[in-house]
């Protein structure tokens, strides 16, 4: 089977600072030199792009300057971090991997990671 399989954790809990990290791992059917990783958010049947980065194998993963995502790559594994999350951002985050070069192109889609975000309680006023 020449399909590309993508694995990601089923559930992740964001930190109190609204940061969630997870690993996206793909089994490559070919020797790719250029890989594109996209994080998608699926709510009901709507799919929206959260962030995307293209990297050359062996090089660092670079997201756009205004991206809420950062990441590092190591072989066929990408460590993704999404920042600035709030409770309303709780949902299913899908890791999509595309082997862009050389041909043939391959698409890999993970089953999604359910990220739970809990807004921190506001600090009570303290008397000094």
């Amino acid at each position: 089977c020449k399909a590309m399989h993508v694995a990601q954790p089923a559930v992740v809990l964001a930190s109190s600072r609204g940061i969630a990290s997870f690993v996206c791992e793909y089994a490559s059917p070919g020797k790719a030199t250029e890989v594109r990783v996209t994080v998608l958010r699926q709510a009901d049947s709507q799919v929206t792009e959260v962030c995307a980065a293209t990297y050359m194998m062996g090089n660092e993963l670079t997201f756009l300057d205004d991206s809420i995502c950062t990441g590092t790559s190591s072989g066929n594994q990408v460590n993704l971090t999404i920042q600035g999350l709030r409770a309303m951002d709780t949902g299913l985050y899908i890791c999509k991997v595309e082997l862009m070069y050389p041909p043939p192109y391959y698409l890999g889609i993970g089953n999604g990671t359910q990220i739970y975000v809990i807004d921190p309680e506001p600090c009570p006023d303290s008397d000094f």
Partner: antibody, heavy 118, light 108 residues
Framework: QVQLVESGGGVVQPGRSLRLSCAAS????????VNWVRQAPGKGLEWVAV????????YYADSVKGRFTISRDNSKNTLFLQMNSLRAEDTAVYYC???????????WGQGTLVTVSS | EIVLTQSPGTLSLSPGERATLSCRAS???????LAWYQQKPGQAPRLLIY???SRATGIPDRFSGSGSGTDFTLTISRLEPEDFAVYYC?????????FGPGTKVDIK
Amino acid sequence: QVQLVESGGGVVQPGRSLRLSCAASGFTFSRFGVNWVRQAPGKGLEWVAVIWYDGSNKYYADSVKGRFTISRDNSKNTLFLQMNSLRAEDTAVYYCARVHQLGPFDSWGQGTLVTVSS
Amino acid sequence: EIVLTQSPGTLSLSPGERATLSCRASQSVSSSYLAWYQQKPGQAPRLLIYGASSRATGIPDRFSGSGSGTDFTLTISRLEPEDFAVYYCQQYGSSPFTFGPGTKVDIK
């Protein structure tokens, strides 16, 4: 809403060239891959080519490789197909189709007819 | 290249009946990357099902998809007059992307 409108079809002699365009609106064009798919009269669908995101990655069907060139202008939200050395078997309706974030072709234009005949 | 074959070539049924269309791949296709399209005469194709079983936006629930590996099925539970059309399967997991030859569902 997503809209794709093809243009540039017509009657052309074998060996000649033609350039098709597809104007896109209703979505952020640069964030999506776009395809050309063709359909010969009375026949099924045949994938022709795809171009990804910034235009640096392109893939073609063997039947058109070396003769057709797919390109895009993200500043004008437009997709192109340059068709050279046309043959009678290239006669078809040519559709542009957007790639959904999860991979299938979710939005299609109405098509433009290319007839290659002497 | 993954070759897709569809059967039957033509399916003659009456409105209200159940339609079962088959798509077979020459090699294993992950179910995540198998789609079904509907095409009516003079119109562009329309995405019905992706990921083998997920309905596209606005597609009625009488359409359902199933299958894995090399065998996939599109089922129309009760045919409506507007469902008589040609149906194509497609794999989009690797290039070249390929379509099946189509199944025509016509009125008996």
